[in-house]
Interface confidence: low
């Protein structure tokens, strides 16, 4: 059977207002883009560009939007139903084990190694030994020992939650 919502638990004046920002929770939950009031009687809209909620919820407050740090670019703004998407600037990357900051990509591989992967917003350049093909994860080598390369172009977004 095809049926849209038939719930009638809203006050008549709420149903009549096309721009109304409140309604009653359904089974104690409020829809994405809203949070529940302290008395549990109303769903209150999140503020566009300030906070958000992505799921049906019983949160007393919407989640605060992430602010992109310096060294990051904003791929998409925060809406009431989706957090800001930030990405490291070109030439920098964010590691999974240190997600709080973007780090500069190495400019090249140590002597005796070749580059097999570009700098992306989520990974440093990847170097392997010419002979063995094993990966290198050491410190940045001295300048005279590097084979320089330009940073890679970002390929896809890396989403952060605030």
């Amino acid at each position: 059977e095809s049926a849209l919502i038939t719930q009638q638990d809203l006050a008549p004046q709420q149903r009549a207002a096309p721009q109304q920002k409140r309604s009653s929770p359904s089974e104690g939950l409020c829809p994405p883009g809203h949070h529940i009031s302290e008395d549990g009687r109303d769903c209150i809209s999140c503020k566009y560009g300030q906070d958000y909620s992505t799921h049906w919820n019983d949160l007393l407050f919407c989640l605060r939007c992430t602010r992109c740090d310096s060294g990051e670019v904003e791929l998409s703004p925060c809406t009431t139903t989706r957090n800001t998407v930030c990405q490291c600037e070109e030439g920098t990357f964010r590691e999974e084990d240190s997600p709080e900051m973007c780090r500069k990509c190495r400019t090249g591989c140590p002597r005796g190694m070749v580059k097999v992967g570009d700098c992306t917003p989520w990974s440093d350049i990847e170097c392997v030994h010419k002979e063995s093909g094993t990966k290198h994860s050491g410190e940045v080598p001295a300048v005279e020992e590097t084979v320089t390369s330009s940073p890679g172009t970002p390929a896809s977004p890396c989403s952060l939650s605030g």
Epitope: S2, I5, T6, S23, P31, H34
Partner: nanobody, 122 residues
Framework: QVQLQESGGGLVQAGGSLRLSCVAS????????MGWYRQAPGKQRDLVAQ????????NYAPSMEGRFAISRDNAKSTVYLQMNNLKPEDTAVYYC???????????????WGQGTQVTVSS
């Protein structure tokens, strides 16, 4: 399973109006939000407007509020988007969306229509 079918798109001059319709077939349960999103070429899909819980609460992207109005007709299982004072930058594919909550907190299914093209000429 939910199927969504949009209609009402087309070519319109700047300043004109269009009314999009989205008919839902299949089961759409009590706890749901229906909405419209749009995607311009080379851009990501963005929220236009959402209507929830029997039409009692609406949510618009700021640039749409005042020009666009979302409504629904439960008897016809249809959601509408009335678009007035259209601008060339409103040109996009408009998608109908249904978010259907399951019994578990925070778990909901997301359903999309195939989209309808809206082109606003200057």
């Amino acid at each position: 399973q939910v199927q969504l079918q949009e209609s009402g798109g087309g070519l319109v001059q700047a300043g004109g109006s269009l009314r999009l319709s989205c008919v839902a077939s299949g089961s759409i349960f009590t706890n749901n939000a229906m909405g419209w999103y749009r995607q311009a070429p080379g851009k990501q899909r963005d929220l236009v407007a959402q209507i929830t819980m029997g039409g009692g609460i609406t949510n618009y992207a700021p640039s749409m509020e005042g020009r666009f109005a979302i409504s629904r007709d439960n008897a016809k299982s249809t959601v509408y988007l009335q678009m007035n004072n259209l601008k060339p930058e409103d040109t996009a594919v408009y998608y109908c969306n249904a978010e259907v909550k399951s019994a578990d907190w925070g778990a909901y299914a997301n359903y999309w229509g195939q989209g309808t093209q809206v082109t606003v000429s200057s």
